[in-house]
């Protein structure tokens, strides 16, 4: 019983109220003690005796200080589609939440009243919006150049492999089949499994970029069921950032070393203004792509030897813009001298392209100490990669204009996996569920 039990019951002063953890008993017209959580009032107070509390019986509880004659009954046992996240004790009710692969279709004050299984997208369709603890999955048809051959609540459309010689063309539900030569995998934004909300899914739990639902999601007319078929294959995504980052870092170091050497030769101080642009991917305007939709400007101090890069996929529909793109420390808008700016933007490569060009430009200003007019100490240019890979509708040699005092160091790189693949969406079929479409 509370500490003030020795003083209760007592008659409150006219117009006064009872103290904390006390209640006013109408019958006794006295302030009496409440019972603590886990107990209930076995005997109510009188003018001469205080409340008598007793522990709650099994499967009953009280969560608050109270004067109820009986404890509350714990909720019924969790159903087979639920998980008991909080057991029934004398002080708290049982809480049931939906087990992995299910979501809460009907919630209650705490926990879930009714769970429903997350629906699966059938072959030819990928997840446009992942299921959450309280919402179902939304599917979309796979865009041209992508496919899904699984029945899954987590798999999104994956890019067709790029064949040197195609034996069987891919379609929405089947990957392309190549002849014996080794194929490469087109890396379309979102060519990964979806991130999964905690406690809603069991299979395919991989933290990966947010889904690319690219132009158009959840369109077309309804269609029907198909036999379940689990399993999927993930695509290589994480190395992309690493490749770009390492490339940027390398080029930055080369540029700095180059300028240091030139400075030693000419005995002129460096103007600490380094600008690194990594990479510049021309947008595929021919397919209505959105181009670099999110550009993150990340700054690093001059002494920093690393560059935080962030790859962003252009997507029109359901995607969590920053959910899986944590901003690097100090990632603020770059301004002023002595900063390295790294901006990345996503674009599409043409469906049949053999590679995505990455234009890496390192601009190094070498300044004269006297009048601050910079002199270009050197200009190096190198081009590598597949010249056929430039997306249609964008200039093949898209150059950043340089002023006379800037040193250009341009490089086009091609990785075995195309950095960014097609984000085209399959236009809607009527009768096709939720077909995605490009902007008109």
């Amino acid at each position: 019983l509370p500490a003030q039990v020795a003083f209760t019951p007592y008659a409150p002063e006219p117009g006064g109220t009872c103290r904390l953890r006390e209640y006013y008993d109408q019958t006794a017209q006295m302030c009496c003690s409440k019972c603590p959580p886990g107990q209930h009032a076995k005997v109510f107070c009188t003018k001469t005796s205080d409340t008598v509390c007793d522990s709650c019986e099994d499967s009953t509880y009280t969560q608050l200080w109270n004067w109820v004659p009986e404890c509350l009954s714990c909720g019924s046992r969790c159903s087979s589609d639920q998980v008991e996240t909080q057991a029934c004790t004398r002080e708290q009710n049982r809480i049931c939440t939906c087990r992995p692969g299910w979501y809460c279709a009907l919630s209650k004050q705490e926990g879930c009243r009714l769970c429903a299984q997350l629906r699966k997208c059938r072959p030819g369709f990928g997840v446009a919006r992942p299921g959450t603890e309280t919402s179902d999955v939304v599917c979309k048809p796979c865009a041209p150049g992508t496919f899904s051959n699984t029945t899954s609540s987590t798999d999104i459309c994956r890019p067709h492999q790029i064949c040197h010689v195609v034996a069987i063309p891919g379609n929405a539900s089947m990957d392309a089949v190549c002849t014996s030569t080794s194929p490469t995998r087109s890396m379309a934004p979102g060519a990964v499994h979806l991130p999964q909300p905690v406690s809603t899914r069991s299979q395919h739990t991989q933290p990966t970029p947010a889904p690319s639902t690219a132009p158009g999601t959840s369109f077309l007319l309804p269609v029907g069921p198909s036999p379940p078929a689990e399993g999927s294959t993930g695509d290589i995504v994480l190395p992309v950032g690493l490749i770009v980052g390492v490339t940027a870092l390398g080029l930055l170091i080369i540029g700095v070393v180059n300028c240091v050497i030139m400075t030693q030769v000419k005995k002129k101080p460096l103007c600490l203004q380094r600008e690194t642009k990594v990479p510049h991917l021309p947008a595929d305007k021919a397919r209505g792509a959105q181009g670099p939709e999110q550009q993150h400007l990340l700054t690093t101090v001059p002494s920093s030897s690393s560059s935080s890069l962030e790859s962003s996929a252009s997507a029109l529909d359901r995607r969590a813009p920053t959910r899986n793109q944590p901003q690097a420390p100090g990632a603020e808008k770059a301004s002023g001298a002595g900063e390295a700016r790294a901006s990345t933007g996503s674009s599409d490569s043409s469906p049949g392209g053999h590679g995505t060009q990455v234009n890496v430009t390192c601009i190094v200003n070498v300044c004269s100490s006297s009048d601050h007019s910079s002199q270009c100490s050197s200009q190096a240019s190198s081009t590598m990669g597949d010249t056929d890979a430039s997306p249609s509708g964008s200039p093949k040699d898209e150059q950043v204009p340089f002023s006379k005092e800037e040193c250009a160091f341009r490089s086009q790189l091609e990785t075995p996996e195309t950095l960014l693949g097609s984000t085209e969406e399959k236009p809607l079929p009527l009768g096709v569920p939720d077909a995605g479409m490009k902007p008109s």
């Epitope: 919402s135 158009g216 999601t217 269609v223 198909s226 236009p427």
Partner: antibody, heavy 121, light 110 residues
């Protein structure tokens, strides 16, 4: 039971405007793309417009682009088609249709019963 | 002028097998799923076939769909008088619009 009920059709003069509505029930409206499809008397089906489940994407047939606007109000479970600058050739039965999102378990393919729009002077 | 080409009419006697064709191109049927709809007089269209050859629940197995290259076909076996209706094929192209065939009016003779 899934139900789609179109309304708002009627007789209108060329150049006039009309707003069609489609009230949806029996399913989670906000999870499905929605379409308008029309059928001129004695003719075939013609797709008119589509709006994505979240209302952020809209696409139109060339024949109605710039004149018709598709929209939805997920809080009211209602699909709309605002038709402006109507022409005689827009005369048709207008159906609202629900996509089923490509689910493996949902065989429901649903159309409303249609509402007749007549454009005549 | 429909992008997907269907014969305007087809006919058969009860019990017969009738096939309705639908011709497109590589950019629509060749690359994507085909859907078939049945429209009985005075009613809204009803999905018969999706994903080229799958039937929604409730559609009799007398109806079957197939696709080869840029063409698709709907076969109706054991023809019945209640099958008399308009049949539409549908697909989609990369130009963002849903495509319908012009429709085939099926007549059950006798």
């Amino acid at each position: 039971e899934v139900q789609l009920l179109e309304s708002g059709g009627g007789l209108v003069q060329p150049g006039g405007s009309l707003r069609l509505s489609c009230a949806a029930s029996g399913f989670t409206f906000s999870a499905y793309g929605m379409h308008w499809v029309r059928q001129a008397p004695g003719k075939g089906l013609e797709w008119v417009a589509v709006v994505s489940y979240d209302g952020r994407e809209k696409h139109y047939a060339d024949s109605v682009k710039g004149r018709f606007t598709i929209s939805r109000d997920n809080s009211k479970n209602t699909l709309y088609l605002q038709m402006n600058s109507l022409r005689a050739e827009d005369t048709a039965v207008y159906y609202c249709a629900r996509s089923d999102g490509g689910y493996d378990s949902d065989s429901g393919y649903y159309w409303g019963q249609g509402t007749l729009v007549t454009v005549s002077s | 002028q429909s992008v997907l080409t269907q014969p305007p009419s087809a006919s058969g006697t009860p019990g017969q097998r009738v096939t309705i064709s639908c011709s497109g191109s590589t950019s629509n049927i060749g690359s994507n799923f085909v859907y078939w709809y049945q429209q009985l007089p005075g009613t809204a269209p009803k999905l018969l076939i999706y994903d080229n050859n799958k039937r929604p629940s409730g559609v009799p197995d007398r109806f079957s769909g197939s696709k080869s290259g840029t063409s698709a076909s709907l076969a109706i076996s054991g023809l019945r008088s209640e099958d008399e209706a308009d049949y539409y094929c549908s697909s989609y192209a990369y130009s963002d619009n849903i495509l319908f065939g012009g429709g085939t009016k099926l007549t059950v003779l006798g």
